[in-house]
């Protein structure tokens, strides 16, 4: 483990002459950093630099070119990669005083004059002198207040609510601080914090807006953490709403967003007592340009049964919001002329669901359907083929005589989707054809009988069976069947000899 860094000069505190320069050197076994009293804006005359030396140690020098009262305070050197937020900053400290006959007290920010006390707890009124030897007294409306004083911290004690003034005398000259206002605050166990981001998806160039609202609490510190924070990209605003109840609305605006602004946007509200903290976060994504993704929940070849009601659902992810349309066979779907409807519903911020609904499927609903989603940056489409499945039906069953040869052909025309299969059966004993057991399937390999099949179009098929010679009356059955159903028709074939006898008669 690393031993604590060391500081030169090796002292707990040091008094530095006004307007003089001073430097502090920190030595460590790893990279070291300085924490010092002034804020970033005030520290223009503080220079931090790394120094090479041959000791093998890391050396960081803090240099102040012209010391002022504002440089009075605690300087801490620490290992910058080993600190965790919950522990006190661990390092070496040196306290620097810069006495100024015209500035008895170290300048403070306005918030430092607000001292919040929680439930009779002790508090510090932070008036620190620039000279450790300066005597200081604390006063309120009733006179001098007895409290212990430490020039590095201020007055420590249990204070009642109200204004307090620190008073010092330097070379016969009296100095007073502006009043420190002590407020009592009941500790609340919860902070009511709400975050709102109307959008979480953006594209380059747009403005990100996130708000956090704190309810029923006036004394709150709210910090934003977001990807562009280090570059100071965000603009923060505070709006105070007092009616019907207290509400502090903090808004973070990041103009001209880029992909690098993607990430977690977090607001952390802390009660002024610093005891209670609540955090909320939202993940924002910024895309280089708009996008569209289409995700159908069905395949590229779909079937629907005749008269069936069927829905085809397509999920769409898109930003900016897309315009969604449907085509049939590359023509815009005119819904009022058909029993087909489409709708689009927004599921989430960038998720949409479009449905194509067939109310009562008809044969003419078969075709190629296309969903087209487009916005200013992208166009995507998905096409699927729809087949309306129709049960088999026989359109025609006719026979055809071959004249004197005695041959006969039977033609069976059937329709349906999918295309029906045609099967032939014969019954040779015409008197017994009412009995199903008298029927036999006609096999392809029977001599003198030829079966053939031709598809006429996508939904019509013609089957033919040719008998080389019909010597006695037989019955022929055509059976057309597909997935949805079967139909059969029968026909009598009369032998030519019998036919001529009938003709004569």
């Amino acid at each position: 483990q690393l031993s604590l860094p060391s500081i030169l000069p090796n002292e707990n505190e040091k008094v530095v002459q006004l307007n003089s320069s001073f430097s502090l050197r920190c030595f460590g076994e790893s990279e070291v950093s300085w924490q010092y009293p002034m804020s970033e804006e005030e520290s223009s005359d503080v220079e931090i630099r790394n120094e090479e030396n041959n000791s093998g140690l890391f050396v960081t020098v803090l240099e102040v070119s012209s010391a002022s009262a504002a440089h009075t305070g605690l300087y801490t050197c620490y290992y910058n990669h080993t600190q965790t937020e919950e522990n006190e900053l661990e390092g070496r400290h040196i306290y620097i005083y810069v006495p100024d006959p015209d500035v008895a007290f170290v300048p403070l920010g306005m918030t430092d004059y607000l001292v919040i006390v929680e439930d009779d707890d002790s508090a510090i009124i932070p008036c620190r002198t620039t000279d450790p030897e300066t005597p200081v007294t604390l006063h309120n409306s009733e006179g001098v207040v007895p409290a212990s004083y430490d020039s590095r911290q201020g007055f420590n004690g249990t204070f009642t609510v109200g204004p307090y003034i620190c008073e010092a005398t330097v070379k016969g000259k009296k100095f007073q601080t502006i009043p420190f206002n002590v407020y009592a605050l009941k500790a609340t166990s919860e902070l009511d914090l709400e975050m709102e981001a109307l959008k979480t998806v953006y594209k380059s160039g747009e403005t990100i807006v996130v708000t956090c609202a704190v309810f029923n609490n006036e004394v709150v510190d709210l910090q934003w953490t977001y990807p562009g924070e280090v570059k100071g990209k965000g603009i923060t605003m505070l709006e105070e709403i007092k009616v019907p109840s207290i509400k502090l609305v903090y808004t973070l605006t990041v103009p001209e967003a880029t992909v690098k602004d993607s990430g977690d946007y977090e607001c952390a509200a802390r009660q002024a007592t610093r005891e209670v903290k609540e955090m909320k976060k939202v993940t924002i994504s910024v895309h280089e340009k708009g996008f569209i993704e289409i995700k159908p929940t069905f395949s590229q070849l779909e079937a629907v049964n005749l008269h069936e009601v069927k829905h085809f659902v397509v999920e769409v992810r898109a930003y900016p919001p897309p315009r969604i349309s449907w085509l049939k066979n590359n023509l815009t779907l005119i819904e009022n002329l058909t029993e087909i409807t489409t709708d689009v519903e927004k599921i989430q911020e960038i998720r949409y669901r479009s449905k194509l609904k067939l109310i009562r499927a008809k044969e003419e609903d078969s075709g190629h359907y296309t969903i087209v989603a487009q916005n200013e940056d992208a166009v995507k489409s998905y096409t699927f083929e729809l087949l309306t499945q129709v049960p088999s039906s026989i359109l025609d069953l006719v026979d055809d005589h071959h004249g004197s040869t005695g041959g006969q052909t039977v033609r069976c025309t059937a329709e349906g989707t999918p295309l029906p299969d045609i099967e032939w059966m014969i019954c040779k004993d015409i008197k017994k054809c009412n009995n199903e057991t008298s029927w036999t399937i006609l096999a392809n390999n029977v001599s003198n009988i030829i079966t053939e099949i031709h598809s006429r179009d996508r939904s019509t098929v013609e089957g033919r069976v040719t008998f080389a010679k019909v010597e006695e009356t037989i019955a022929v059955r055509c059976l057309a069947k597909n997935l949805l159903g079967a139909e059969n028709r029968e026909l009598k074939l009369v032998a030519p000899t019998l036919r001529s006898e009938l003709t004569v008669a």
Epitope: T82, T84, E86, N87, E88, E90, E275, K277
Partner: antibody, heavy 118, light 107 residues
Framework: QVQLVESGGGVVQPGRSLRLSCAAS????????MHWVRQAPGKGLEWVAV????????YYVDSVKGRFTISRDNSKNTLYLQMNSLRAEDTAVYYC???????????WGQGTLVTVSS | DIQMTQSPSSVSASVGDRVTITCRAS??????LAWYQQKPGKAPKLLIF???SLQSGVPSRFSGSGSGTDFTLTISSLQPEDFATYYC?????????FGQGTKVEIK
């Protein structure tokens, strides 16, 4: 040497409360963020809560938010865990822990068993 | 929240064996990772912090490596007192999630 001693565990009915304490010695307690970690019987370790060295922040695992409160008294070198609305799934050995080694826990107590059962 | 996943969940080994346990974070945690050893009925003990730094007093047969999302604890030559359960933990930000543990058992 460093010592962390937990106390306050015991058997309690669901819905009731219990307060655990952790007495620290042998190190500068007021400079350390302190944590509670628990371990259900036969299960792994689960981080429960943290309180900053100066009480400025507290964080909790989602499953105890709104029911457990971590607090500390730096003048007494003591860490507390107030557990309300206890559930059967809160049954565990509760350890207090802290440390400075890049956020790892150098110091652990011996643990105190909390059993939530009707 | 960042998840920590350890593998294997248990390993059988003999004295003198080299044992390797891995830990994967669901997001980049740089080198903010610690390894602990726990024996039945005892509190965990810190072995490694900052992914590869050996805690003082811990034998040098224990070593840690990795950065970002993938980390490894290695015991170069297993000793009888090393049979225990080992946990990884992310050590920055909150929640300070632990891995589910790896039990090292005697073969």
């Amino acid at each position: 040497q460093v010592q962390l001693v937990e106390s306050g565990g015991g058997v309690v009915q669901p819905g009731r409360s219990l307060r655990l304490s952790c007495a620290a010695s042998g190190f500068t307690f007021s400079s350390y963020g302190m944590h509670w970690v628990r371990q259900a019987p036969g299960k792994g370790l689960e981080w429960v809560a943290v309180i900053w060295y100066d009480r400025s922040n507290k964080y909790y695992v989602d499953s105890v938010k709104g029911r457990f409160t971590i607090s500390r008294d730096n003048s007494k070198n003591t860490l507390y865990l107030q557990m309300n609305s206890l559930r059967a799934e809160d049954t565990a050995v509760y350890y207090c822990a802290g440390g400075r080694s890049r956020g790892a826990f150098d110091y652990w107590g011996q643990g105190t068993l909390v059993t939530v059962s009707s | 929240d960042i998840q920590m996943t350890q593998s294997p969940s248990s390993v059988s080994a003999s004295v003198g064996d080299r044992v390797t346990i891995t830990c994967r974070a669901s997001q980049d945690i740089s080198s903010w990772l610690a390894w602990y050893q726990q024996k039945p009925g005892k509190a965990p003990k810190l072995l490694i912090f900052a992914a590869s730094s050996l805690q003082s007093g811990v034998p040098s047969r224990f070593s840690g490596s990795g950065s970002g999302t993938d980390f490894t604890l290695t015991i170069s030559s297993l000793q009888p007192e090393d049979f225990a359960t080992y946990y990884c933990q992310r050590t920055s930000s909150f929640p300070r999630t632990f891995g589910q543990g790896t039990k090292v058992e005697i073969k």
